[in-house]
Interface confidence: medium
């Protein structure tokens, strides 16, 4: 059975979109209605994990290329990073935990939790141009995403 | 308490076949998360990964044994099987079968092996 | 495939000494790794599990750090009972590959 996957962008609570700055790293920033298509559209992939009533475990690849979203330990803390993968491999239905992420729906906004880091959350700064980053919701943080599908 | 045992390990001829049998107790391969994998060891040599099967069914082989040989389960007999055809010299080893859960693949209880000889 | 490296295949070391046993990774495995003890004869048993976390049961003396491509098994105060086979095992992609073992030999 091949692995189901839908194709979404996401902008953050503050409407700024996400963008693929270097070959690994993905950047949050208001794009005006001429760059528009520079957001990276994201491959969700619903795979092997944990599901509960408010938690669907999914993974996140960036359409059209081998990479996805993980989460590792770095230096004593839960990071994020791009990962290339084998596309002969990947997406598959039992991702490694790395790879996976508790799709958490809050009203009309999503939260997207480390599966391997509990309490960690994809995030964004409040300022523009910094990286998308793996934070444990304290401060200013942004944590909640809206997803817009786009067709396959 | 965990207990994993080999066996169906002998001499064979180069070419023949082999099942080897990993009857365990103390854990259930119905259980979600739950992986048994066979490893070997060639005499005097480090430990290889064989080939591993999930709880649900999903399977994973190394290159050098995928297409030759076949892991599969019986939940009912609490066993893990190694079919292994067409075989080399360099599969002489004492296989190992172990236990871990799905991801990351830590292998946390092991069987004592069983020798392969391939030989003529 | 990503190849695992234990330099040192054999290592002379005496009762009370602190042993440094070394892996390296071909790439970056994010702290995918586990260390194993071999004697010949018993089970394999996990030591360390994560890079760093200790199985249950096993003596606080062995304790594992590491991360990127280099990671190390260290164990404070040799006892008898240590004398044995030491592998690391990566577990970040298939195929999960294994050092090829580092021989911890009384001196």
């Known amino acids: 059975v091949p692995i189901r996957q839908l194709h979404y962008r996401l902008r953050d609570e503050q409407q700024k979109s996400l963008v693929l700055s270097d070959p690994y790293e993905l950047k949050a920033l208001h794009l005006n209605g001429q760059n528009i298509n520079q957001q990276v559209i994201f491959s969700m992939s619903f795979v092997q994990g944990e599901p509960s009533n408010d938690k669907i475990p999914v993974a996140l690849g960036l359409k059209g290329k081998n990479l996805y979203l993980s989460c590792v330990m770095k230096d004593g803390t839960p990071t994020l990073q791009l990962e290339s993968v084998d596309p002969k491999q990947y997406p598959k239905k039992k991702m490694e935990k790395r790879f996976v992420f508790n799709k958490i729906e809050v009203k009309s906004k999503v939260e997207f939790e480390s599966a391997e880091f509990p309490n960690w959350y994809i995030s964004t700064s409040q300022a523009e141009h910094k990286p998308v980053f793996l934070g444990n919701n304290s401060g200013q943080d942004i944590i909640d995403f809206t997803m817009e599908s786009v067709s396959s | 308490q965990v207990q994993l045992v080999e066996s169906g390990g002998g001499v064979v001829q180069p070419g023949r076949s082999l099942r080897l049998s990993c009857a365990f107790s103390g854990f259930s391969l119905s259980t979600s998360g739950m992986g048994v994998g066979w490893i070997r060891q060639a005499p005097g040599k480090g430990l290889e990964w064989v080939a591993h099967?999930?709880?649900?069914?999903?399977?994973s082989y190394a290159d050098s044994v995928k297409g030759r040989f076949t892991i599969s389960k019986d939940n009912s007999k609490n066993t893990v099987y190694l079919q292994m055809n067409s075989l080399r010299a360099e599969d002489t080893a004492v296989y190992f079968c172990?236990?871990?859960?799905?991801?990351?693949?830590?292998?946390?209880?092991w069987g004592q092996g069983t020798l392969v000889t391939v030989s003529s | 495939d990503i190849q695992m490296t234990q330099s040192t295949s054999s290592l002379s070391a005496s009762v009370g000494d602190r042993v440094t046993i070394t892996c390296r990774a071909s790439?970056?495995?994010?702290?995918?790794l586990s260390w194993y003890q071999q004697k010949p004869g018993k089970a394999v048993k996990l030591l360390i599990y994560y890079t760093s976390k200790l199985h249950s049961g096993v003596p606080s003396r062995f304790s594992g750090s590491g991360s990127g491509t280099d990671y190390t098994l260290t164990i404070s105060s040799l006892q008898q009972e240590d004398f044995a086979t030491y592998f690391c095992?990566?577990?970040?992609?298939?195929?999960?590959?294994f050092g090829q073992g580092t021989k911890l030999e009384i001196k």
């Open positions: 099967i999930w709880w649900d069914g999903d399977e």
């Open positions: 095992l990566q577990g970040k992609m298939l195929p999960w590959t």
């Open positions: 172990a236990r871990n859960r799905y991801d990351p693949p830590w292998f946390v209880d």
């Open positions: 790439q970056d495995i994010s702290n995918y």
